[in-house]
């Protein structure tokens, strides 16, 4: 049998079944999430759920700039460290960097310290580059 | 084609309101996010105001902030300025822009309209 | 706010000179910034973007380069019709900033 691979939309890059688009656009948590989902197709901020999609996505991103922290789905609605993805995937993997988890920071970025391999908790209203995420 | 228009510019009172418009055609307007950018005489480009696809997320420079509301009527193809509290310095040639798929830039921009505040 | 300086403000060049324009943020900056063209009377056109990336249609004597707080946009060989006024923009900050524009004259 003839697999096909689905296609995404343009600008979208393919990775084990998902569909991934990398925003260089300066936005909030919430601001970022609901540009994610005017893109239809189902996208949310993007969920990571292995190391290997880390990898692939830190990978990609490497290829635009290695500074910049990006908005990812994880936050903390109850600001009770209680983090969830927003698209409701199970929270099972974590990547935190050893930062403090304190303070009134209950989104998660991408950290580019470690070349977007792990995660650090900030300021939702923070406006920064974003990833969204949907399964084709 | 992308093509987007601009109207309502005139000359205003200081401290009076003015409404610009901006008619969009030749792509799908909401899907893309929106800006107004302004050219005072003789000077450089100033980044204004911007609104999201949908319209739920609007920004604003701090120099109008609170004067200006921005806003798009998605039926019309339509982008909106709402001008308040009008100063001299608001003087400039208004463009209408779309913002870049991907970035926080400018990729289509209309001719401008001229907003002209005096006494 | 990110501030971008241009250099220099003016510039006068013959048709076929090569001719670079400086801008330099105020702080280190990653890929994100972008050079308009600007004629008398006319709205800007973008001609690059994430510093080096050609926008479709523009000819490619353009050419953009640098990072961190050094960015350079070099016309290889000037026509009559690349007199104009150019903008670089950065998109890495809130809120996006211009450079106060250079001014390209035929000498």
């Known amino acids: 049998d003839i697999i096909m691979r689905p296609s995404c939309a343009p600008g979208w890059f393919y990775h084990k079944s998902n569909c991934y688009g990398y925003f260089r656009k300066l936005r909030n948590w919430s601001d970022a999430e609901l540009e994610c989902q005017s893109y239809g197709n189902g996208a949310h901020l993007a969920s990571i759920l292995s190391l290997k999609e880390a990898s692939t996505i830190a990978e990609y991103i490497s290829g635009y700039q290695r500074s910049q922290p990006i908005w990812i789905g994880l936050h903390d609605p109850q600001k009770r460290q209680q983090w969830q993805w927003i698209d409701g995937a199970m929270y099972l993997y974590r990547s935190w960097s050893g930062k403090s988890m304190g303070g009134n920071k209950h989104c998660a970025e991408m950290s580019s310290n470690n070349n977007f391999l792990t995660w650090s908790s900030n300021e939702c209203n923070k406006r920064q580059h974003f990833l969204c995420k949907y399964r084709p | 084609e992308v093509q987007l228009l601009e109207s309502g510019g005139g000359l205003v009172q200081p401290g009076g309101s003015l409404r610009l418009s901006c008619a969009a055609s030749?792509?799908?307007?909401?899907?893309?996010?929106m800006s107004w950018v302004r050219q005072a005489p003789g000077k450089g480009l100033e980044w204004v105001s911007a609104?999201?696809?949908?319209?739920?997320?609007?920004y604003y420079a701090d120099s109008v902030k609170g004067r200006f509301t921005i806003s798009r009527d998605n039926s019309k193809n339509t982008l909106y300025l709402q001008m308040n509290s009008l100063r001299a310095e608001d003087t400039a040639v208004y463009y209408c822009?779309?913002?870049?798929?991907?970035?926080?830039?400018?990729?289509?921009w209309g001719r401008g309209t001229m907003v002209t505040v005096s006494s | 706010d990110i501030q971008l300086t241009q250099s220099p403000s003016s510039l006068s060049a013959s048709v076929g000179d090569k001719v670079t324009i400086a801008c330099r943020p105020s702080?280190?900056?990653?890929?994100?910034l972008a050079w308009y063209q600007q004629k008398p009377g006319k709205p800007p056109r973008l001609l690059i973007y994430?510093?080096?990336t050609l926008e479709s249609g523009v000819p490619s004597r353009f050419s953009g380069s640098g990072s961190g707080t050094y960015f350079t946009l070099t016309i290889s060989s000037l026509q009559p019709e690349d007199f104009a006024t150019y903008y670089c923009?950065?998109?890495?900050?809130?809120?996006?900033?211009f450079g106060q524009g250079t001014r390209l004259e035929i000498k």
């Open positions: 702080q280190g900056i990653s890929s994100a």
């Open positions: 923009q950065q998109f890495d900050n809130y809120p996006v900033t």
């Open positions: 609104i999201s696809g949908s319209g739920g997320s609007t």
């Open positions: 030749g792509f799908t307007f909401s899907s893309y996010a």
């Open positions: 994430d510093v080096s």
């Open positions: 822009a779309r913002i870049h798929n991907w970035n926080d830039m400018f990729d289509y």
